[in-house]
């Protein structure tokens, strides 16, 4: 149950796909991938207002107790709802493989 | 891939489960259940620093991003891995019902 | 606007061979990096096999190493998927794409300029 997608804070503000160019070294990879040399990461980033694609109820749930309780119940978090495969070339103790991976870049994000 | 669960920052600092008890009221609830009267609502809360209970890799390039790039990538998030059900008696039109619902309590974390 | 289509599977007994054609409309092969993916029921999609635009390397899976060759035929403007010794787990809807960019190439559709076809059934059984 995604709830509003609307964001109070303003344009941009809110729990949204951003990317991030990073570099194998960046990623601390070098060692063991050889390509690509640049990853486009897709991320989840920004804030989670009351309600704003609240992923289910624990989240709703979340949004109450932190209005009431902000010290000890933090916001919901931005993480992502799915992902996108990525498949990388790899170093092996035998050559070189593709690889792919099925959680290394969101697709689309929620609050949680 | 779930990495070390050792917390650096000092015992129940990080990522764990925790209980907060909460009443219809402080949910937003009373209106249309009935019972449980007050909740043990379990959810996930603490610190997410490098590796701890990293739950895939888009996690592990999150924390390597956010060393790098702090105000722009956030460290990852303490977040259910899982959910335990719960029961609740709702008011209906009719009357009342029971209503399970499999995304209310967090049953365990992991950072994402 | 490159457009892919692949064809060349069906049915066939483990230990059978299948060679896969993806077929290039709209723009040259040439200088464009070429991957075959797969996606069986249930699963995400799975980079099987990339041959590189700049000097011709070729990668694989290590589930499909020694089993399946990649090529292309720049004057058909066509590559190819030589898969021998199937098995059962190679069970699953065969994709191609290009991209610009070199080896891997990603599974993304019209993302970044890498286009990808439609996809040819292969059903390994007994």
């Known amino acids: 149950a995604r709830n509003g997608d609307h964001c109070p804070l303003g344009p941009g503000r809110c729990c949204r796909l951003h990317t991030v160019r990073a570099s194998l070294e960046d990623l601390g990879w070098a060692d063991w991938v050889l390509s690509p040399r640049e990853v486009q990461v897709t991320m989840c980033i920004g804030a989670c207002p009351s309600q704003f694609r609240a992923a289910n109820m624990h989240a709703q749930i979340k949004t109450s107790l932190h209005r009431l309780k902000p010290d000890t119940v933090p916001a919901p978090c931005c993480v992502p709802a799915s992902y996108n495969p990525m498949v990388l070339i790899q170093k092996t103790d035998t050559g070189v493989s593709l690889q792919t991976y099925d959680d290394l870049l969101a697709k689309d994000c929620h609050c949680i | 891939a779930r990495n070390g669960d050792h917390c650096p920052l000092g015992p129940g600092r990080c990522c764990r489960l925790h209980t907060v008890r909460a009443s219809l009221e402080d949910l937003g609830w009373a209106d249309w259940v009935l019972s449980p009267r007050e909740v043990q609502v379990t959810m996930c809360i603490g610190a997410c620093p490098s590796q701890f209970r990293a739950a895939n890799m888009h996690a592990q390039i999150k924390t390597s991003l956010h060393r790098l790039k702090p105000d722009t990538v956030p460290a990852p998030c303490c977040v259910p891995a899982s959910y335990n059900p719960m029961v609740l008696i709702q008011k209906t039109d009719t009357g009342v019902s029971l209503q399970t619902y499999d995304d209310l309590l967090a049953k365990d974390c992991h950072c994402i | 606007q490159l457009q892919l289509v692949e064809s060349g599977g069906g049915e066939v007994q483990p230990g059978g061979s299948l060679r896969l054609s993806c077929a290039a409309s709209?723009?040259?092969?040439?200088?464009?990096?070429i991957g075959w993916f797969r996606q069986a029921p249930g699963k995400g999609l799975e980079g099987v096999s990339c041959?590189?635009?700049?000097?011709?390397?070729?990668y694989y899976a290590d589930s499909v190493k020694g089993r399946f060759t990649i090529s292309r035929d720049n004057a058909k403007n066509t590559a190819y998927l030589q898969m021998n010794s199937l098995r059962p787990e190679d069970t699953a809807v065969y994709y191609c794409?290009?991209?610009?960019?070199?080896?891997?190439?990603?599974?993304?559709?019209?993302?970044?300029?890498?286009?990808r076809g439609q996809g040819t059934q292969v059903t390994v059984s007994s």
């Open positions: 041959i590189s635009s700049s000097d011709g390397s070729t």
């Open positions: 709209g723009a040259t092969l040439d200088d464009l990096s």
């Open positions: 794409a290009a991209d610009r960019e070199d080896c891997p190439v990603q599974p993304w559709g019209i993302v970044a300029g890498t286009s």
